[in-house]
């Protein structure tokens, strides 16, 4: 690498994948193995992160990138980059303190991962209940009484199922 | 599950070529780093051999004991791992092993060199 | 290359004692070293990564510990299937290297 020659900072032209050295009077190293620089004019550079453990690698480390992790299965990421991996639970499950426990009655869960949600009120939109809620699946709310009356079409289609995540209004 | 499974080994004669395969399953294999093992009937484990992935443009490492005659590559397309092993010696006897991230090991595979 | 000093290389003790083996690199590895238990016709076991971390599934009688670049695995309370060779291997510096194994066996 050749030496820098930046007025200002002899450091700012060091590219990613290197390091100002201080000790080489301001030559541009290459990161030595298992670290990396992602931006320039960095004065150091950084350990690659270790995927062990729950964590697995999805990407090694380069000298320009750290590497990139995911979760052994049973397990999914938590958090910026993965940072954590919590564990799966099944369908109608959700995590505790204690570990997985099944949905309480009138709540739901349909992912591994997250808590349960209370099941859909129909009544608050005028429909009624076409298909029962479990621990696994929100209940289907189907046309309104008033629209099964004798002459009224009974082929409203049933209201589209709440986002993951989202909570009755 | 991560699954490694070693293949390709045999009985061959001082100076044969035999290669290894590894067909790797259960993670992303064309973005990580992968290694060869060895070891010796009766002996403990040499690592021998590793290839990095594209964003470290492939690179190669070996030992000392096998640099010049033995060569790692792969084919992220099939996800399978390689070992090609020429001038082999009596002393290259051993059950090669391909591996991941420390943590995942294939069952083995026996080369045996013997005349 | 980093020449990794493993000890002892036998070892012979009964269900229930605690255990320790020794690993010493020859250069600085950062901590990057793991543990590894084999068994007759099997491939190694990973125990033990990044010197003190236990790798899951891998009962909590397991530790690893650092001073230096000294590394030692501790078994708390040896149990019946504790009887294998255990192999130290630093993964900092290629060519990675691992200590010559210790075989712990049963008194």
């Known amino acids: 690498f050749e030496r820098t020659r930046s007025l200002q900072d002899p450091c700012s032209n060091c590219p990613a994948g290197t390091f100002c050295d201080n000790n080489r009077n301001q030559i541009c190293s290459p990161c030595p193995p298992n670290s990396f620089s992602s931006a320039g004019g960095q004065r150091t550079c950084d350990i690659c992160r270790q995927c062990k453990g729950v964590f697995r690698t999805r990407k090694e480390c380069s000298s320009t990138s750290n590497a990139e992790c995911d979760c052994t299965p049973g397990f999914h990421c938590l958090g910026a980059g993965c940072s954590m991996c919590e564990q799966d639970c099944k369908q109608g499950q959700e995590l505790t303190k204690k570990g997985c426990k099944d949905c309480c009655f009138g709540t739901f869960n349909d992912q591994k991962r997250g808590i349960c949600r209370p099941w859909t009120n129909c009544s608050l939109d005028g429909k009624s209940v076409l298909v029962n809620g479990t621990k696994e699946r929100d209940v289907v709310c189907g046309p309104s009484p008033a629209d099964l009356s004798p002459g009224a079409s009974s082929v409203t289609p049933p209201a589209p199922a709440r986002e993951p995540g989202h909570s009755p209004q | 599950e991560v699954q490694l499974v070693e293949s390709g080994g045999g009985l061959v004669k001082p100076g044969g070529s035999l290669r290894l395969s590894c067909a790797a399953s259960?993670?992303?294999?064309?973005?990580?780093?992968m290694n060869w093992v060895r070891q010796a009937p009766g002996k403990g484990l040499e690592w021998i051999a590793r290839?990095?992935?594209?964003?470290?443009?492939?690179?190669?490492y070996y030992a000392d004991s096998v640099k010049d005659r033995f060569t790692i590559s792969r084919d992220d397309s099939k996800n399978t791992l390689y070992l090609q092993m020429n001038s082999l010696k009596t002393e290259d006897t051993a059950v090669y092993y391909c591996?991941?991230?420390?943590?995942?090991w294939g069952q083995g595979t026996l080369v045996t060199v013997s005349s | 290359d980093i020449q990794m000093t493993q000890s002892p290389s036998s070892l012979s003790a009964s269900v229930g004692d605690r255990v320790t083996i020794t690993c010493k690199a020859s250069d600085h590895i950062n901590n990057w070293l793991a543990w590894y238990q084999q068994k007759p016709g099997k491939a190694p076991k990973l125990l033990i990564f990044?010197?003190?971390s236990l790798e899951t599934g891998v009962p909590s009688r397991f530790s690893g510990s650092a001073s230096g670049n000294d590394y030692t695995l501790t078994i708390s309370s040896l149990q019946p299937e504790d009887f294998a060779t255990y192999y130290c291997?630093?993964?900092?510096?290629?060519?990675?290297?691992f200590g010559q194994g210790t075989k712990l066996e049963i008194k």
């Open positions: 290839i990095r992935s594209k964003i470290n443009n492939y690179a190669t």
């Open positions: 291997q630093q993964y900092w510096s290629i060519p990675y290297t």
């Open positions: 259960g993670f992303i294999f064309n973005t990580n780093a």
């Open positions: 990044g010197a003190t």
């Open positions: 591996n991941w991230d420390e943590a995942y």
